[in-house]
Interface confidence: medium
Amino acid sequence: KEEQTTFRDCAEIFKSGLTTSGIYTLTFPNSTEEIKAYCDMEAGGGGWTIIQRREDGSVDFQRTWKEYKVGFGNPSGEYWLGNEFVSQLTNQQRYVLKIHLKDWEGNEAYSLYEHFYLSSEELNYRIHLKGLTGTAGKISSISQPGNDFSTKDGDNDKCICKCSQMLTGGWWFDACGPSNLNGMYYPQRQNTNKFNGIKWYYWKGSGYSLKATTMMIRPADF
């Protein structure tokens, strides 16, 4: 059979025999448009498409709606893959979302959602999640039901305040909600009592800013 040369996600790349983690070129569904993504081919069986990573504060996440739409940063380091690509991809088939978190004391935890997708831009890339398991809290730190995405120039939250401007970063803010993995990156020893940091409330509480986060997706039937 003819060898596959374009891939929609890292799971397809993994199944094609390319099983080394790294940066790969993905193609938008039903399009020739391409995007660079980091593929984790080792964790939990591999085939994970990394859609977000924070690790050192090297990239500014207080970006515009358009930047969150198309993506920004460096796939080998801190980056946001892009809402439009993720929306298109997750509406093609069923995906799981795994969020891996690290604190400053050497602990790690994760939240796994058995079904994840983003609505279209017309619906403000609203997040849809079902079936939470994992070690980063029994309650979802992404408010349920899912909220619209908000940025500093696109306020779609449920607060009279502007959550994205107040807490920084684009996120699925409620009012403003128990998480924001795109907040300010505070270094160790400055990471407590910070309301606008990298927050996952049901693991570390409201004022704790995390050391590292990774959001990754994979087809549910992988």
Epitope: M184, Q188, R189, Q190
Partner: antibody, heavy 121, light 106 residues
């Protein structure tokens, strides 16, 4: 009383490395983080990174990632800062400074006397 | 990074005068803020931390105020030993310093 005594002035060539030491006395060395700050002639102060003398854990400023290494020897209460691949603009005075020890990870209450590094071919 | 802007760059005053130095942060740093004094050929010396708390051994003529983005260092009656360069520093989000204010003889 608390004292931080740094090694003497260094003259080195571009592309080489320099290692500056900072010997602490008058307090428990492992109880306070040690920071490194540099200052070009007539210029302001620039934070480079810190080391936790207790664990050896470090935190480097983005600008110096990959070029700076901070270590310590607890047996002689000494912290070290090594800067590699030196350029001509790496010629300021380098200071070690002790963290005040409060939770906010903040002000530097005691400083070394400074070490002048000259990078010249 | 948070940018710290000091003003004025140079302040010409006479001994016994009151000196007021300002520092502005590009975003809020709460009260995680300090002032340092530096004399030629010497290391900086911590004067004020937490925006308004005097460090050990610092005379009462030095006082600090402000929070958020605007901070002030006041020297109520300048002594000859106070002529130096003064730096502000935030330690809220990483660590950055202002470019300094030189207090010189008028």
């Amino acid at each position: 009383q608390v004292q931080l005594v740094q090694s003497g002035a260094e003259v080195t060539k571009p592309g080489a490395s320099v290692k500056v030491s900072c010997k602490a006395s008058g307090y428990t060395f492992t109880a306070y983080h040690m920071y490194w700050v540099r200052q070009a002639p007539g210029q302001g102060l620039e934070w480079m990174g810190w080391i936790n003398p207790n664990s050896g854990g470090t935190n480097y400023a983005q600008k110096f990632q990959g070029r700076v290494t901070m270590t310590r020897d607890t047996s002689i209460s000494t912290a070290y800062m090594e800067l590699s691949r030196l350029r001509s603009d790496d010629s300021p005075v380098y200071y070690c400074a002790r963290d005040q020890g409060i939770a906010a990870a903040g002000p530097f209450d005691y400083w070394g006397q400074g070490t002048l590094v000259t990078v010249s071919s | 990074e948070i940018v710290m802007t000091q003003s004025p760059a140079t302040l010409s005053v006479s001994p016994g005068d009151r000196a007021t130095l300002s520092c502005r942060a590009s975003q809020s740093v709460s009260s995680n803020f300090a002032w340092y004094q530096q004399k030629p050929g010497q290391a900086p010396r911590l004067l004020i931390y937490g925006s308004s708390t005097r460090a050990t051994g610092i005379p009462a003529r030095f006082s600090g105020s402000g929070s958020g983005t605007e901070f002030t260092l006041t020297i109520s009656s300048l002594q000859s030993e106070d002529f130096a360069v003064y730096y502000c520093q935030q330690y809220h989000y990483w660590w950055t310093f202002g470019q300094g204010t030189k207090v010189e003889f008028k």
